[in-house]
Interface confidence: low
Amino acid sequence: TEGCDPSRVRVHGPGIQSGTTNKPNKFTVETRGAGTGGLGLAVEGPSEAKMSCMDNKDGSCSVEYIPYEAGTYSLNVTYGGHQVPGSPFKVPVHDVTDASKVKCSGPGLSPGMVRANLPQSFQVDTSKAGVAPLQVKVQGPKGLVEPVDVVDNADGTQTVNYVPSREGPYSISVLYGDEEVPRSPFKVKVLPTHDASKVKASGPGLNTTGVPASLPVEFTIDAKDAGEGLLAVQITDPEGKPKKTHIQDNHDGTYTVAYVPDVTGRYTILIKYGGDEIPFSPYRVRAVPTGDASKCTVTVSIGGHGLGAGIGPTIQIGEETVITVDTKAAGKGKVTCTVCTPDGSEVDVDVVENEDGTFDIFYTAPQPGKYVICVRFGGEHVPNSPFQVTALAGDQPSVQPPLRSQQLAPQYTYAQGGQQTWAPERPLVGVNGLDVTSLRPFDLVIPFTIKKGEITGEVRMPSGKVAQPTITDNKDGTVTVRYAPSEAGLHEMDIRYDNMHIPGSPLQFYVDYVNCGHVTAYGPGLTHGVVNKPATFTVNTKDAGEGGLSLAIEGPSKAEISCTDNQDGTCSVSYLPVLPGDYSILVKYNEQHVPGSPFTA
């Protein structure tokens, strides 16, 4: 139209940038200097939009429109029938958003529950806050932004997942439509992955007033508040030998540990979580006798042939031997048995309890030589135990005359004026000139569920050599790691699942010398120590007969030695090194070095 210039029309205001549903969205059209023409306004979009225009009588109009649904709207502004600059305007229209109506909750925001290196999550409920983009920012202790994953649950809620990489203060900002939601930024103190100080052990199996020897006992480990770590329980008997331990994962943050204290005396129970000892570990528990072992009688049959009331002095290798123990008159208690081979290791023994008050002991001698059989009831030796038998190869004639009237053959023969002691011949000499056969295999039961993937292990020995332990999935939420050491000293074990360390790995452990029928010394003080802190070890003389124990420590400083007789055939030795360096610990029995002596710590 003559005198009309649409290019001089100016449109401005928030309503052409963005809009909100169910609310008036305003913009202004200025036609000053554009001549005379008709102003045309039209809105197209997902819904109808109510539109109104007010002439300001100053060459401008104020326009309002109310859209009813979210989406992109097209605003057409014409002057004199022609589009003005910028028209049609594409306007994103959102629902009304109110960040104050957003609710955040869940363990990933809860104090005392968030632990490093473990997946954390929390929920964001935006169902009452309208539709807007959700932004989440996780900042670590040094302000470093860490990855975060937001999953839309399609029900008006979102799940936020993150894995804090370290312990310390974290700040989690949650923005909804560029606005902080209530309580944001959330301040979260991330705790260590595991905290052994929060692990609790309790139950009858830890009762220091005494547990009944030979009967199974159990205790509970509560790690509910301790994060995720590797639980390791090592129980050693009064001689320092590791005991078979059964750990059951109760899948509620607690574990039940069962063991059988088969010998009377003091047991040491070491509990570690994530490689750290829990409070009050190691526990020391006394096993007290039950029933009356002196009332038991023993008979034996070899290869199914009865030998009457006694244990014959010779057996055949590879042939199953059955020892029957009649405990009817002995009261409450159970039979336990160990069979020591000529080289000082132990043979697998099965003990079967019969309904008639008897127990059958089954074992097979794998090699020729002298065997020592310890049969106990209620933790105490039955009459004449320990017994000594000689295993012969099939073609080897028995050189021993049969014992008169099938007497039991005790390990010790008594002579007037003293005691004669039997000890097995010296076993093979192995690493470092030490007795390799006395390094016992041990089992570590770890609560860990293998879903899919491979669990692997590696042991680094003190010499630097590497060995592979045997790992078995017990299909009950635990795996058993079995390792037969060939060196004494500090070892390190890696356990990985799909090539990733499992919680608590790598773990360190000490290997000491224990043996059947010898004087032995074992304990941390023989391998390492800390200046001005008592270093301790134990000397076991239980199976050694009469003799004198002598101790000496040579090193950079004079080290005070104290020795306590535990009245159970063992001595607790403590020494105090006051200067750093290598100390030589000499342990002699009857002027003879015990296996491993002199030790270097």
Epitope: K200, K224, R284
Partner: antibody
Framework: EVKLVESGGGLVQPGGSLKLSCAAS????????MSWVRQTPEKRLEWVAY????????YYPDTVKGRFTISRDNAKNTLYLQMSSLKSEDTAMYYC???????????WGQGTLVTVSA | DIVMTQSHKFMSTSVGDRVSITCKAS??????VAWYQQKPGQSPKLLIY???HRYTGVPDRFTGSGSGTDFTFTISGVQAEDLAVYFC?????????FGAGTKLELK
């Protein structure tokens, strides 16, 4: 934060009875063995009673055996000490403490004062 | 009953000093000895258990040693806040018994 709060102390005549309570919070009460320990006016510490975490086992020293009974309600996170036939030598500050026997006493309450006097 | 004897009722020290408190058991208690600190108006606080193990959160200036019948509790570098009464206790057998306490005070 671990909290043990004793209550129920007060003045009682010789031969009388009193029941002390200890409300526990901040830890899994049912996992912990618990004890009562008292401190005499001369500041000597004396162990008075022990109860296992499930409540099945109790121990007492001879000085209170037969007169004092320790009990617990794990659902309420509360430990109790029922004291009867009280004597003047039972006058003390009574503390409830976690553990005892298996372990030393790790957590202690602030104490409640029991005075036995005519 | 096992009697725990703390030979010194009082011990004088200065800030920065090293001080050792001894405790003797009337019979062998192996390593089952704990040490507690008690400040005026407060309940006792566990410092050491099993003769030499520091309890969670206890500063490393506090150490324990000994086994059998003779036990020692040491503070290396006494601080003003360490002035308190220190008790030993055996947790070897029932009845559980405490020492009479040693009060640490400034010279």
């Amino acid at each position: 934060e671990v909290k043990l709060v004793e209550s129920g102390g007060g003045l009682v005549q010789p031969g009388g009875s009193l029941k002390l309570s200890c409300a526990a919070s901040g830890f899994t009460f049912s996992s912990y063995t618990m004890s009562w320990v008292r401190q005499t006016p001369e500041k000597r510490l004396e162990w008075v009673a022990y109860i296992s975490n499930g409540g099945g086992s109790t121990y007492y020293p001879d000085t209170v055996k037969g007169r004092f009974t320790i009990s617990r309600d794990n659902a309420k996170n509360t430990l109790y000490l029922q004291m009867s036939s009280l004597k003047s030598e039972d006058t003390a500050m009574y503390y409830c403490a976690s553990d005892g026997i298996i372990r030393p006493f790790a957590y202690w309450g602030q104490g409640t004062l029991v005075t036995v006097s005519a | 009953d096992i009697v725990m004897t703390q030979s010194h009722k009082f011990m004088s020290t200065s800030v920065g000093d090293r001080v050792s408190i001894t405790c003797k058991a009337s019979q062998d208690v192996s390593l089952d000895v704990a040490w507690y600190q008690q400040k005026p108006g407060q309940s006792p606080k566990l410092l050491i258990y099993s003769a030499s193990h520091r309890y969670t959160g206890v500063p490393d200036r506090f150490t324990g040693s000994g086994s059998g019948t003779d036990f020692t509790f040491t503070i290396s570098g006494v601080q003003a806040e360490d002035l308190a009464v220190y008790f030993c206790q055996q947790h070897y057998s029932t009845p559980l018994t405490f020492g009479a306490g040693t009060k640490l005070e400034l010279k």
